[in-house]
Structure formats: C-alpha cells, structure tokens
C-alpha cells in the first residue's frame, strides 16, 4: 500500500529539496523562504527569486517554508505558573518553562502546568526533581507516601493501600482500642 500524501506534500515531492512547486504552474519549482520569513509572492518563473518577506513582530517561522503568513508567537500561560525562558524572535517561538525548584506536568501534548518540587519532609529524596518529573520520595518508618508526600501512619485508614506499610502501627492502634485504655 502506498501511503497517502497530502496535496502540499505531493506537490513538494516533485521539486528538489529546498524548493516547492508553483501553485499555478506545476512545471516551475520555486525556492522556499528561509526561516524568519514567509511567502509574499511565488517566483515568476524558473530560476527567478521567490518574494519572501520578514515576519512581523509577534510572529515567526522556525524552518524554511512557503507559508502565506507567519505563525503567531506563543504566550506563556501565567495561570499555569509558566514563565518566559526566551522571547519570540522572527525565527523561533517563545520558550516557556517553570521557575527554579518547580517541574512541568503535562496535562496534554501542548499544555503544561508548573508545580513545586516535593521536599520529601519525613522522608528522603530517592530521585531528584527533574524538568518534567517531580521528586521521588522514600518515606521514613511510621510514614507512608500519599500523592508524593510522606503522611503519618496515624492517618492510615484500614481501607487504604497504606495498610501494608503501616501494619505495625495499625495493629498497635487496634490493640489499644481492644484493651479499652484511654
């Protein structure tokens, strides 16, 4: 089976790399525009220059192209705790990230939120906080891991998964209740 090519890919594949087929005349291959520019007018004929114009402020193209418009620069999402790492230029989109001691959690492919790295209170750092992953904690005895925080076994209810980790403490609590001591 031959993979289906979109019209644009089909047209481009007829021309050598770095060129594209003229939309009105498929016998002409025009030179693509450099990154940081966009297509204003197709080349008038073979061997003649494509009319490329520089992207305006607030827009960019990051690779050679024959786009009729530059792409709008991304904005860092304040509500998600994002900060600007580097601003948008004509040939590169805005780069957004998180502050120091924070990590990115991706809710979807192109949406991330910044959260503070866990400090592992009542535990030890098993794996340090990374750009896209929270600290991995190991809890001290008498504590169990809940939502990446070390919580006292006194907060462990019988139905929760902590029962195995907190078994001695639970038995002690049960024993105290059974003996009727105050």
């Amino acid at each position: 089976l031959v993979p289906h090519l979109g019209d644009r890919e089909k047209r481009d594949s007829v021309c050598p790399q770095g060129k594209y087929i003229h939309p009105q005349n498929n016998s002409i291959c025009c030179t693509k525009c450099h990154k940081g520019t966009y297509l204003y007018n197709d080349c008038p004929g073979p061997g003649q220059d494509t009319d490329c114009r520089e992207c305006e402020s607030g827009s960019f193209t990051a690779s050679e192209n024959h786009l009729r418009h530059c792409l709008s620069c991304s904005k860092c999402r304040k509500e998600m705790g994002q900060v600007e790492i580097s601003s948008c230029t004509v040939d590169r989109d805005t780069v957004c990230g998180c502050r120091k001691n924070q990590y990115r959690h991706y809710w979807s492919e192109n949406l991330f939120q910044c959260f503070n790295c866990s400090l592992c209170l009542n535990g030890t750092v098993h794996l340090s906080c990374q750009e896209k992953q929270n600290t991995v904690c190991t809890c001290h005895a008498g504590f169990f891991l809940r939502e990446n925080e070390c919580v006292s076994c006194s907060n462990c209810k019988k139905s929760l998964e902590c029962t195995k980790l907190c078994l001695p403490q639970i038995e002690n609590v049960k024993g105290t209740e059974d003996s009727g001591t105050t």
């Epitope: 304040k78 509500e79 809710w107 939120q113 959260f115 929270n134 939502e147 990446n148």
Partner: nanobody, 119 residues
Framework: EVQLLESGGGLVQPGGSLRLSCAAS????????MVWIRQAPGKGLEWVSH????????YYADSVKGRFTISRDNSKNTLYLQMNSLRAEDTAVYYC????????????WGQGTLVTVSS
Amino acid sequence: EVQLLESGGGLVQPGGSLRLSCAASGFTFAHEPMVWIRQAPGKGLEWVSHIDRVGQDTYYADSVKGRFTISRDNSKNTLYLQMNSLRAEDTAVYYCAMLPKRGPRFDYWGQGTLVTVSS
C-alpha cells in the same frame, strides 16, 4: 465546603449545540482559574478548556478549538461551556474543576453532566 454542580448535558444530534453550566459555592470563585475536563466512555480524562480568574485568558484542546467557548460570570459564581458543531467523539461526561494548585490532581470537581452526541 467546596461544591461544583454541572448541568446542561443531554442528547443532541451531530452538528447541534449545548451549553453547559457549572454552579460554584464554598470558595471565592473569582480567585480561581477553572477547568472543563471530560471522560469519554472507556477512556481517560481529557483536558478540554480552561479560563483564568477574570475570564481573559482561555485555552482549548485542539480537538475542540473553534467549536467550544469557555466563559465565566464571577457575579453569578458560574462557569460555562458553549459547545457548537458537536460530533460523536464529543460524547463524554463533562466535569468542571478548580485548576489544581499543589500538585497534578483535581482536589475539587463536580459530579459531571453527560453529553451524548448521536443521530
């Protein structure tokens, strides 16, 4: 006690429209960015849209961009999701939630409203 109550779901034909509402109480609604998430039958949670505190900045998943509009009325403590040009793949339970603060989990979200798109 934080409460979020969604309404407005129902059965609609492909191409149709629905407007979901989420009534909020138990917290200062105007101080919280809000989120619509959905869960299609047998699938995981999908982030649909979110809106900042004042209703200025919005975000839409690619799958709903140009068809859905999120808005809020802080004077009524209500979040909305206007859904147009509905498709079969929009069939899901829709939940509103407060944007998480402390970690990547939804501490506060509603019971959901079912949207079914079918002819």
